[in-house]
Interface confidence: medium
């Protein structure tokens, strides 16, 4: 395209999520208490009032962040929300302060830690969910790092986080069965979902695997896993926790 | 959706319409029978109260979204680092009171996995009931359109969004305009197909106008948030 006047990026032009990176690459901004809203009877198709989630207006090279809502006369500074409810922005005081810490904006429903995070199995203490699987042990028993699974790449390769090596490793297919798959899915957050578990050829070039120690008895799956530099089946576990990403068009194609 | 076309039944089975007081306000994407991904700016106060919201799945026409077919929302979780001024970290989760029944018209989209490489001009799709022209009305029918990912470096150039795009955002559309998401599409999906599987790459967030030249759509970069999403699901279990 002729529009591409910029030089190519120095590092490959890819969008990639590098595992457990911090979600917000910028320092947390002070929390702003939103302005007060007055709810009027809903109209079906009123003008889009208010666009109280502002949009960014760009003018030449000086971007301006609009702070006013998009009124019916309308600045172009809007989020893509159809606030079709006639909620009118009224007088509001902007109280800026660290009192409303960002972490308080969401609540967790845990067993003993309903409002304050995830419970450590060993001590019953609660840790902030953002510290789970972050490479640093916060639970006395380190289980916030031991119970870490993820699916990697478009083939859903199951990887387990090793807090010893501080890195992710694919799980070897040797001795794997669907019960372990169910447990891994549960640990990822898929409560009652499990779709399929199969071995696929590992094309990632891994030289270190997590393998099941079948003689470990009836213990937690994570206690059965150990490091191995070899995987005799030459296959790693591909785990689907939910039958996702299929629409009528693609299911018709595959028939 | 500007420059799109009406969707066929089952083409975007993860798309939901999120209503407040019987009016479509935002879109969302089904990721499990209980969880919907949407935009954080959709649920800013006072709309952070789950009681306000009803989700409709599998229905392509707004007129047919009657009360009994909706799913009530039990919990709204906005990203803790969402910034309403800059729209950084514009993602939220809704947990439904009762799980969706999956069928041919109601299915989840896949969350992207780490290690998924997307090309700079990867073909994607956007969908929603948003306006079909700038300052237009909510659409009666679900629309969808093809868009291309736009490199962050290019989207951050002086002539586009001049460094307003953070790593938690992703641009998609066409620099010449004509095709874009618009008001009412917020929270809805930006998806791409890889290995014959549809992946949720973005949630509709913001843009300057709709379908304007050099003002493509900006979406929450779901890849950055998958860990956060799983943690919320895990904590809830």
């Amino acid at each position: 395209m002729a529009l591409n006047s910029g030089s190519p990026p120095a590092i490959g032009p890819y969008y990639e999520n590098h595992g457990y990176q911090p979600e917000n690459p910028y320092p947390a901004q002070p929390t702003v208490v939103p302005t007060v809203y007055e709810v009027h009877p809903a109209q079906y198709y009123p003008s889009p009032v208010p666009q109280y989630a502002p949009r960014v207006l760009t003018q030449a090279s000086n971007p301006v962040v609009c702070t006013q809502p998009k009124s019916p006369s309308g600045t172009v500074c809007t989020s893509k929300t159809k606030k079709a409810l006639c909620i009118t922005l009224t007088l509001g005081t902007f109280l800026v302060g660290a009192a409303l810490a960002a972490g308080l904006l969401w609540k967790f429903m845990g067993s003993k830690c309903s409002n304050s995070g995830i419970e450590c199995d060993s001590s019953g203490t609660c840790i902030n969910p953002s510290n789970w699987c972050d490479g640093v042990s916060h639970c006395p028993g380190g289980e916030d790092e031991n119970r870490c699974v993820r699916l990697y790449g478009p083939n859903f390769i199951l990887q387990v986080y090793s807090s010893q090596r501080k890195s992710w490793h694919p799980v070897c297919q040797d001795d794997w069965n669907e019960n372990y798959g169910r447990a891994a899915c549960r640990d990822m957050g898929y409560k009652n979902n499990f779709y399929s578990s199969q071995g696929i050829v590992d094309d990632s070039g891994s030289t270190s695997f997590m393998k099941l120690n079948t003689s470990a008895g009836n213990v937690d799956i994570y206690k059965k896993l150990y490091h191995s530099d070899a995987c005799s089946s030459k296959a790693v576990v591909s785990l689907r926790c939910i039958a996702c990403g299929v629409n009528l068009n693609s299911s018709r194609q595959s028939r | 959706i500007v420059g799109g076309e009406s969707a066929l039944p089952g083409a975007w089975p993860w798309q939901v319409s999120l209503h407040v007081q019987n009016v479509h306000v935002c879109g969302g994407s089904i990721i499990t029978p209980e969880w919907i991904v949407t935009a954080a700016h959709c649920v800013e106060k006072p709309l952070n109260n789950p009681a306000h919201w009803t989700a409709f799945a599998g229905i392509l026409r707004q007129s047919f979204m009657f009360y009994g077919a909706g799913y009530q929302v039990e919990k709204v979780i906005s990203h803790p680092n969402y910034d309403s001024k800059t729209k950084n970290n514009d993602i939220a989760l809704m947990k439904l009171q009762k799980p969706l029944t999956f069928n041919d018209l109601v299915k989840p989209v896949c969350l992207p996995n780490p290690g998924m490489m997307l090309q700079p001009e990867q073909l994607c799709w956007i969908s929603g009931w948003g306006a079909t022209e700038e300052k237009g009305k909510t659409s009666e029918v679900l629309n969808a359109a093809k868009v291309l990912l736009i490199e962050t470096q290019r989207c951050n150039s002086r002539y586009v969004y001049d460094n307003l795009i953070t790593p938690a955002m992703i641009c998609a559309g066409f620099l010449q305009g004509n095709v874009d998401s618009c008001q009412g599409d917020s929270g809805g999906p930006l998806v791409t197909s890889k290995n014959n599987i549809w992946w949720l790459i973005g949630d509709t967030s913001w843009g300057s106008g709709c379908a304007k030249a050099y003002r493509p759509g900006v979406y929450g970069n779901v890849m950055v948030f998958t860990d956060w999403i799983y943690r919320q699901m895990r904590a809830d279990g």
Epitope: - | P9, L105, V141
Partner: antibody, heavy 121, light 111 residues
Framework: QVQLQQSGPALVKPGASLKISCEAS????????INWVKQRPGQGLEWIGW????????YYNEKFKGKATLTIDKSSSTAYMLLSSLTSEDSAVYFC??????????????WGTGTTVTVSS | DIVLTQSPASLAVSLGQRATISCRAS??????????MHWYQQKPGQPPKLLIY???NLESGVPARFSGSGSGTDFTLNIHPVEEEDAATYYC?????????FGAGTKLELK
């Protein structure tokens, strides 16, 4: 070919209930809604409601709430309508009809054969 | 509820001539580029048969002598040239919102 086969005619007493069936064949049952339509002798058509077999979700015309109950059996690709507390006003031909659900264009492209219901003491 | 008024209630047309049936809605049934009006034909002892959907689209297998037009509140079904087998009752039906409703019907007879 695509067909909707309905149960045969029925003669029932006032106050009784009746379950009418509509068996679908020739297409994927879960992709479409089944609608029910009433036609009194020499009269026009009245839409009763629909059921979507994919999820079992229903919608009733306000006028028929409490009178008709729609159900499905996915295993046999059959839709049912239960009519309760029958009166002479319920004497009619009842049709099942298919419509696409998701796009909800709301037209009926395939119709059942019709079931004649006579309510008489 | 949207009320559909069909006119005339009945009409008699000679073979080969044009039959025009009108359907008026109590409020607009058009939105987002679609007109949610459909037409059916019903013969005695038979179920209705879809002829036209979304105001002007001919259902597959229906002869091209049937055509539909209109938008907003006023819609028309045209049959030209009328053939003997077209003697029937014709119904319009909207699906703009719920409940779905039908017109009272127009009976077409041949002269």
């Amino acid at each position: 070919q695509v067909q909707l086969q309905q149960s045969g005619p029925a003669l029932v007493k006032p106050g009784a209930s009746l379950k009418i069936s509509c068996e679908a064949s020739g297409y994927t049952f879960t992709y479409y809604s089944i609608n029910w339509v009433k036609q009194r002798p020499g009269q026009g058509l009245e839409w009763i409601g629909w059921i979507f077999p994919g999820s079992g979700s229903t919608y009733y015309n306000e006028k028929f709430k409490g009178k008709a109950t729609l159900t499905i059996d996915k295993s046999s690709s059959t839709a049912y309508m239960l009519l309760s507390s029958l009166t002479s006003e319920d004497s009619a031909v009842y049709f099942c009809a298919r419509s696409d659900y998701g796009s909800a264009y709301g037209y009926f492209d395939v119709w059942g054969t019709g079931t004649t219901v006579t309510v008489s003491s | 509820d949207i009320v559909l008024t069909q006119s005339p209630a009945s009409l008699a047309v000679s073979l080969g001539q044009r039959a025009t049936i009108s359907c008026r809605a109590s409020k607009s049934v058009s939105t987002s580029g679609y007109s949610y009006m459909h037409w059916y034909q019903q013969k005695p002892g038979q179920p209705p048969k879809l002829l036209i959907y979304l105001a002007s689209n001919l259902e597959s297998g229906v002869p091209a002598r049937f055509s539909g037009s209109g938008s907003g509140t006023d819609f028309t079904l045209n049959i030209h040239p009328v053939e003997e087998e077209d003697a029937a009752t014709y119904y319009c039906q909207h699906s703009r919102d719920l409940p779905l409703t039908f017109g009272a019907g127009t009976k077409l007879e041949l002269k």
